[in-house]
């Protein structure tokens, strides 16, 4: 019996198409992606196919304006129009809290939602009890196949989903919904989550009577022969998992941003043993005919949009100095704007010990594309923030030994004078440079913002210590010259909309009044 | 290299049936959809239906419904099409063409010979 | 049905001219349109898949333009071999339908 498998995860509210590196599309003939675009194709091959599941892997929400603006409504829709069979959480899915999740996805949805490792206590049990599911058995032809979800168990450092969600280990709490599934006479077992390909490989090696792992979380781009874009693949697709019980395990993932559609043929034979997988991600370039009719929805939808662009979400009463003058050779109050914001996004109170899980922030001044001018009635709109930050990028959270700092804030300086973009702005961190110095050592003092005090205090770094570091996703991958962050790292979660990020930060404050206040200094 | 290899031509009677036949070589026989296509003596090029051997899926161009019949031989990667009730209007070449829906070249990629079909008493 | 009408049934050119071939759809097709070149005696052959992508092979001077209902196909430099019938063809929606064809004469 053959199966074939659909998948897509990470899309990040990618609905309409994209340029080639997912920011927004500028040249229509060469865009990818976008959700008319993959209707099409999964509409062919259900055509051609007789036994066809479309799956989602999780982190729907969050990444444009469309999340800003529709909250996730636009997630239901979307994805009930392109009739997806089950989707599992991902951590975005809680940036909106539990309500944002309830109101707008879970009881809109037309297809289950699946968490096997989050469970509800306390008075959120029964208000959201069976609106998303452990598990799912689906009719497909002449057979089911089980569906079992999974969620990363760092959501509570990574989103807003609240103190009556408990995260178990992903492991733990599968096992024994596969077994349940088992004993339902249910032979064919996908698990479907979203917490990193390590842990998709995990499950696949450890969790008994799993057959399939389709996964998310970390955009894992696999891929068997010549890749067709730029992405360059982690390995072969399917990557396959030799479980502890000796049976070969498919894993796969499809990158991100709605980008490609995963496809995946598997044959089981009648006891419901993988006999044979094949496939690849189907990269939706531009050749892929968009559908006229979802076209026509998306531009129906995109009306609101363009509304709320022009809309005041906050005001400045000071010049936010976003020049490349500024923010490439010394402090600016922009870089300072956006780092506080990207503090103040992540607060998760962690426990008594520590005031919060993470303190710092560093930005490339390079990052920062444009000042926005207070005597405009000090009117802040998305539209001007699109400006300053024009890149549609993500703030994420890494893991960063102190030594790998250290680097990074002398790589800052190394050719300093020459209007480069590495120049780093910061946030919960106090740096002074001599520029007398020879590049590489030019830092001469570096001060961090302790997390486990209950009075925030500057100390000096620790070259041994590790700790988390809140930047954009330009930095984590290495750009600007930042190598050492991409080899070092230790852990990295992607996070949310950078624009999103700052607008919500303005609107949450309303007036805003950042100030050079001596972060950056040099002897 | 990818070749169909469409049977010879064929002469029939008013009222009976004939069976086509398309051999595919060179690719994965059921990764793709095979079409057949009519085209009568300086006429123009009209779809009749649609198989994908994968699966056996079939689909018709609501004007042949009745009068053809697609079928597909994984084993021996031959598609054929059945036309039965023959008329003097069925006399035309007959085209297999592929269909990659996989792939994003949207149209047929490589077309069979052609297999004329004269239907005359 | 969705009608793919070719307005010109001939169309006479020289060697060395450009020329392009009309199509116009009766309802929106997306980007979902093929051009096929036939000699006579032969199969079609394709030449333009989605609109505009130049299949394996193809010369240059052969490109396709437009989306939505009206689509261009386009000869740079008309060589002596490209006197042929040239078809268009919507793939949106079944049953898929052709264009009558126009024939492209040398002078």
């Known amino acids: 019996w053959e199966l074939t498998i659909l998948h897509t995860n990470d899309v990040h509210s990618r609905l309409e198409q994209t340029s080639e590196d997912s920011s927004k599309c500028v040249n229509a003939s060469r865009c990818m992606g976008g959700v008319a675009r993959l209707f099409t194709k999964v509409q062919q091959i259900r055509r051609a196919e007789p036994n066809v599941l479309l799956l989602d892997a999780g982190d729907q929400y969050q990444g444009t304006i469309w999340f800003t603006v529709y909250k996730g409504a636009e997630v239901a829709h979307f994805m009930n129009a392109l009739r997806y069979d089950a989707m599992a959480l991902g951590n975005h899915e809680f940036d909106n809290g539990v309500e944002g999740l309830i109101e707008p996805l879970l009881k809109e949805a037309k297809f289950p939602i699946l968490s096997a490792n989050i469970k509800a206590k306390g008075p959120l049990a029964s208000q959201i009890s069976g609106l998303y599911l452990p598990y799912k058995v689906l009719p497909v032809g002449d057979e089911v196949v089980g569906i079992v979800g999974y969620t990363s168990k760092e959501t509570p450092f990574l989103s807003n989903p609240g103190t009556n969600l408990v995260f178990e280990d992903e492991i733990t709490a599968l096992q024994p919904e596969v077994d349940k599934l088992k004993t339902l006479n249910v032979n064919k077992i996908i698990a479907l989550g979203h917490s990193g390909f390590e842990t998709d490989k995990l499950i696949a090696q450890k969790v008994r009577g799993v057959d399939v792992v389709v996964g998310g979380h970390s955009n894992t781009f696999l891929y068997t022969g010549n890749p067709p874009s730029k992405e360059v693949p982690a390995g072969k697709y399917p990557f396959i998992v030799t479980s502890d019980d000796g049976r070969k395990v498919p894993v796969v993932q499809a990158y991100a941003f709605g980008k490609y559609l995963g496809y995946l043929k598997i044959e089981f034979d009648e006891r419901g043993n993988v006999i044979s997988s094949h496939g690849n991600p189907i990269l939706l370039n531009s050749s892929i005919p968009e559908d006229p009719s979802i076209k026509a929805d998306i531009n129906k939808w995109r009306i609101k949009l363009d509304n709320y662009s022009t809309q005041e979400l906050g005001k400045t009463i000071v010049y936010l100095d976003g020049s490349s003058q500024s923010c490439r050779f010394r402090e600016c109050n922009m870089g300072n704007l956006i780092c506080d914001a990207m503090i103040n996004n992540n607060l998760r109170h962690a426990d008594e010990m520590f005031w919060n899980h993470v303190s710092m922030c560093i930005l490339n001044g390079g990052g920062i594309r444009s000042p926005i001018d207070e005597r405009n009635n000090g009117t802040i709109t998305w539209e001007n923030l699109a400006a300053v930050l024009p890149f549609g990028g993500t703030f994420d959270l890494v893991q960063l030994k102190g030594s790998t700092l250290k680097k990074a804030f002398e790589h800052s300086v190394h050719r300093y004078g020459q209007s480069t973009g590495e120049f780093l702005q910061v946030g919960g961190i106090h740096v002074v440079y001599d520029l007398s110095r020879k590049p590489g050592d030019r830092v001469v003092k570096l001060d961090v913002l302790c997390t486990k005090c209950r009075v925030p205090s500057y100390d000096p770094l620790k070259m041994d210590e590790i700790y988390k570091v809140i930047l954009p996703n330009f930095l984590a991958n290495g750009g600007d010259g930042f190598q050492m962050i991409k080899d070092e790292l230790l852990r990295h979660d992607s996070g949310d909309q950078d624009i999103n990020v700052v607008s919500t930060y303005i609107s949450k404050m309303k007036v805003i009044y950042p100030a050079v206040e001596g972060r950056i200094k040099f002897s | 290299q990818v070749q169909l290899q469409q049977s010879g031509a064929e002469l029939a009677r008013p009222g009976a049936s004939v069976k086509l036949s398309c051999r595919a070589s060179g690719y994965t026989f059921t990764s793709y959809g095979l079409s057949w296509v009519k085209q009568r003596t300086g006429q123009g090029l009209e779809w009749i239906g649609e198989?994908?051997?994968?699966?056996?899926?079939?689909y018709y161009n609501e004007k042949f419904k009745g009068k053809a019949t697609l079928t597909a031989d994984k084993s021996s990667s031959t598609a054929y099409m059945e036309l039965r009730s023959l008329t003097s209007e069925d006399s035309a070449v007959y085209f297999c063409a592929r269909y990659d829906y996989l792939g994003s070249s949207y149209g047929f990629d490589y077309w069979g010979q052609g297999t004329t079909l004269t239907v005359s008493s | 049905d969705i009608v793919m009408t070719q307005s010109h049934k001939f169309m006479s050119t020289s060697v060395g001219d450009r020329v392009s071939i009309t199509c116009k759809a009766s309802?929106?097709?997306?980007?979902?349109v093929a051009w096929y070149q036939q000699k006579p005696g032969q199969s079609p052959k394709l030449l333009i898949y989605s609109a505009s992508y130049r299949y394996n092979g193809v010369p240059d001077r052969f490109t396709g333009s437009g989306s939505g209902t009206d689509f261009t196909f386009t000869i740079s430099s008309v060589q002596a071999e490209d006197l042929a019938v040239y078809y268009c063809q919507q793939h949106y929606n079944t049953p898929y339908t052709f264009g009558g064809g126009t024939k492209l004469e040398i002078k």
């Open positions: 309802q929106d097709v997306s980007t979902a």
């Open positions: 198989i994908y051997p994968g699966s056996g899926n079939t």
